[in-house]
Interface confidence: low
Amino acid sequence: AEPHSLRYNLMVLSQDESVQSGFLAEGHLDGQPFLRYDRQKRRAKPQGQWAEDVLGAKTWDTETEDLTENGQDLRRTLTHIKDQKGGLHSLQEIRVCEIHEDSSTRGSRHFYYDGELFLSQNLETQESTVPQSSRAQTLAMNVTNFWKEDAMKTKTHYRAMQADCLQKLQRYLKSGVAIRRTVPPMVNVTCSEVSEGNITVTCRASSFYPRNITLTWRQDGVSLSHNTQQWGDVLPDGNGTYQTWVATRIRQGEEQRFTCYMEHSGNHGTHPVPSGKVLVLQSQRTD
């Protein structure tokens, strides 16, 4: 199987030789976005409902501290790149750590200047790889010389960087947040009044993957016949996940007898018709 991975992408910008304050950052867990950095609030925030649901507030405090430190580091590095000319420039760092099926680990970071890769580092062996271009060679020399002047940038520092990344990855995996292939649906049930004492109840499932889902109305625990229900197509929602709905008409006052049954990737749930007008129910996001 593909390894579990934690990836951070940070970027700092300079305008006319002046390095801008702040930075851009995002985090991916097993390829899924789980973190974004809010530049206005200067805080790491969950990206996606599943990250918000499972990871506690402490996670975002820790991530904010770490990203702030990394962002400052990257800003300092950008000030030492001698290649600076007028206009807008960017320095980007992508940091990845992986845990493989055989429990072996990998760690690396990659630096891009104006979108061009100029240095890759193996965090475990401290080996560096520099592309052949003269520009990449010059940039890499600039940066590594600057790091050599920094007493903090020792082999121990890089090992700690890798250990810290792996520690987080293991913690996030234990939290059950690493959705490798399955994204459970959000389910909500709504009622709309129609004439003659009948109401239409609609059960909507959204943001799920894979596409296969069972969504059906039950009366007193028994599935309604197909001809009494109307199904929407299972459609992509533009985020790599899917959405669908099922509706049926019931007698007003009999709401308590009806439930929406959802089954998806081995998980299932039953959602009652709300006594008010709208009720949003969220499926437990489990792996």
């Epitope: 199987a1 593909e2 990836r7 992408n9 995002e26 991916h28 390829g31 899924q32 992508i94 891009y112 979108g115 292939r181 994204v183 993957y209 894979p210 596409r211 296969n212 992509p236 533009g238 985020n239 790599g240 996940t241």
Partner: antibody, heavy 119, light 107 residues
Framework: EVQLVQSGAEVKKPGESLKISCKGS????????IGWVRQMPGKGLEWLGI????????RYSPSFQGQVTISADKSISTAYLQWSSLKASDTAIYYC????????????WGQGTLVTVSS | EIVLTQSPATLSLSPGERATLSCRAS??????LAWFQQKPGQAPRLLIY???NRATGIPARFSGSGSGTDFTLTISSLEPEDFAVYYC?????????FGQGTKVEIK
């Protein structure tokens, strides 16, 4: 309508460099991976690698690591496949294709770019 | 990397007949297997993903089954436009790999 439009056919000499493109439209380009697939004359499909245009994170098939470079410019919704020094064995049709965030297989494909390398 | 072996290499059938194509993986790929159709001069088209899910707009005569190492694509009744090359592809392990293809030709 989702579309991937690739650049036209190329005829090159061995040792020359080349960059072919794939422009996405009709969807959020930064939300989906773009992959590249090779098909040599009369042969099957081979996976080269993939890029996430949102942050240009790339992964290569080990067979093609170091042989090609995959890049993207999200400002113009375009992905690229390039060679610094072409070989006759690079002669093939190259397809770009879109893969969803949740790792769904390639659901939309470009029309293909024929690259011919001959002295 | 995972090797996918498709059989038979060529399948000669008449319109209206049932086609059964096989794809075997060198190790388990769970259900992360897709099937693509390719006609001459065209790009491949996704038919089936995750072993048994039909892609959008694919006719019901196409169905997929299997999990682990053995997978089958079935075309219940061949239409003239179904004569093409079919590839399986796994995405369980990196790198994703394709089978060598099965050509379905008119008998």
């Amino acid at each position: 309508e989702v579309q991937l439009v690739q650049s036209g056919a190329e005829v090159k000499k061995p040792g020359e460099s080349l960059k072919i493109s794939c422009k996405g439209s009709g969807y959020s380009f930064t939300n989906y991976w773009i992959g590249w697939v090779r098909q040599m004359p009369g042969k099957g499909l081979e996976w080269l690698g993939i890029i996430h245009p949102g942050d240009s994170y790339t992964r290569y098939s080990p067979s093609f690591q170091g042989q090609v470079t995959i890049s993207a410019d999200k400002s113009i919704s375009t992905a690229y496949l390039q060679w610094s020094s072409l070989k006759a064995s690079d002669t093939a049709i190259y397809y770009c294709a879109r893969e969803g965030i949740a790792a769904t297989p390639f659901d939309y494909w470009g029309q293909g770019t024929l690259v011919t390398v001959s002295s | 990397e995972i090797v996918l072996t498709q059989s038979p290499a060529t399948l000669s059938l008449s319109p209206g007949e049932r086609a059964t194509l096989s794809c075997r993986a060198s190790q388990s790929v769970s259900s992360y297997l897709a099937w693509f159709q390719q006609k001459p001069g065209q790009a491949p088209r996704l038919l089936i993903y995750d072993a048994s899910n039909r892609a959008t707009g694919i006719p019901a005569r196409f169905s997929g089954s299997g999990s682990g190492t053995d997978f089958t694509l079935t075309i219940s009744s061949l239409e003239p436009e179904d004569f093409a090359v079919y590839y399986c592809q796994q995405r369980s392990n990196w790198p994703p790999t394709f089978g060598q293809g099965t050509k379905v030709e008119i008998k």
